[in-house]
């Protein structure tokens, strides 16, 4: 069964290389599991970028080598993605499926385009 | 066109075991994820089990974890979902699905096949 995500269309990761964005489902129903992906677009290649499950009103748990962290509050989700560098700029697409109780939801939303700018080399002072 | 055929359905006691195999046809492709969901009949589509090619990542559902085992063999395009300690509860049509890319849901979807637990 299909569901909505909505997510902000433009974010711009910091000097730091971070992006922050909240991922926002319209649940049916009570879910009490939910799975989250993220993946990123680019030049018609569509790679995973980090995943992760949580129960309601938990924490997201990520694999412990993902760049991405977040946190949960009702049916939103917030995201931050770390160690961003412009190479990484791109569209990065939140996925979200209701995996418990039945009926299974899936939701795909329209993408992020996050810029990256790598921060210029600080100058040698004397 | 891609088409996805299950087999290894039955009846079986409570208890048994069973390996269901979902077989993809129709040109050479490397899914995105492959999965298992059931339907019982007069209840709602369960997910069942996934597994993302990408990282060889599986994901269970928690009434059939510690009992049910999905894997897949990419030479052969098949995915295998193998069902011990099986019980009445997980008597239901079992369909195999796939995704071409993480970004397409699951495309395409096998005809089902019936699992039937007796106790």
């Known amino acids: 069964k299909a569901m909505h995500v909505a997510q902000p269309a433009v974010v711009l990761a910091s000097s730091r290389g971070i992006a922050s964005f909240v991922c926002e489902y319209a649940s049916p129903g009570k879910a009490t599991e939910v799975r989250v992906t993220v993946l990123r677009q680019a030049d018609s290649q569509v790679t995973e970028v980090c995943a992760a499950t949580y129960m309601m009103g938990n924490e997201l748990t990520f694999l412990d080598d993902s760049i991405c962290t977040g946190t949960s509050s009702g049916n939103q989700v917030n995201l931050t993605i770390q160690g961003l560098r412009a190479m990484d700029t791109g569209l990065y697409i939140c996925k979200v499926e209701l995996m418990y109780p039945p009926p299974y939801y899936l939701g795909i939303g329209n993408g992020t385009q996050i810029y990256v700018i790598d921060p210029e080399p600080c100058p040698d002072s004397d | 066109e891609v088409q996805l055929v299950e087999s290894g359905g039955g009846v079986v006691q409570a208890g048994g075991s069973l390996r269901l195999s979902c077989a993809a046809s129709g040109g050479t492709f490397s899914f995105y994820g492959m999965g298992w969901f059931r339907q019982a009949p007069g209840k709602e589509q369960e997910f069942v089990a996934d597994?993302?090619?990408?990282?060889?990542?599986?994901y269970y559902a928690d009434s059939v974890k510690g009992r049910f085992t999905i894997s897949r063999d990419n030479a052969k395009n098949t995915v295998y979902l193998q069902m011990n300690s099986l019980k009445p509860e997980d008597t239901a049509v079992y369909y195999c699905?796939?995704?071409?890319?993480?970004?397409?849901?699951?495309?395409?979807w096998g005809q089902g096949t019936q699992v039937k637990v007796s106790s």
């Open positions: 597994i993302r090619t990408s990282a060889g990542r599986t």
């Open positions: 699905a796939a995704e071409m890319s993480g970004i397409s849901g699951w495309d395409y």
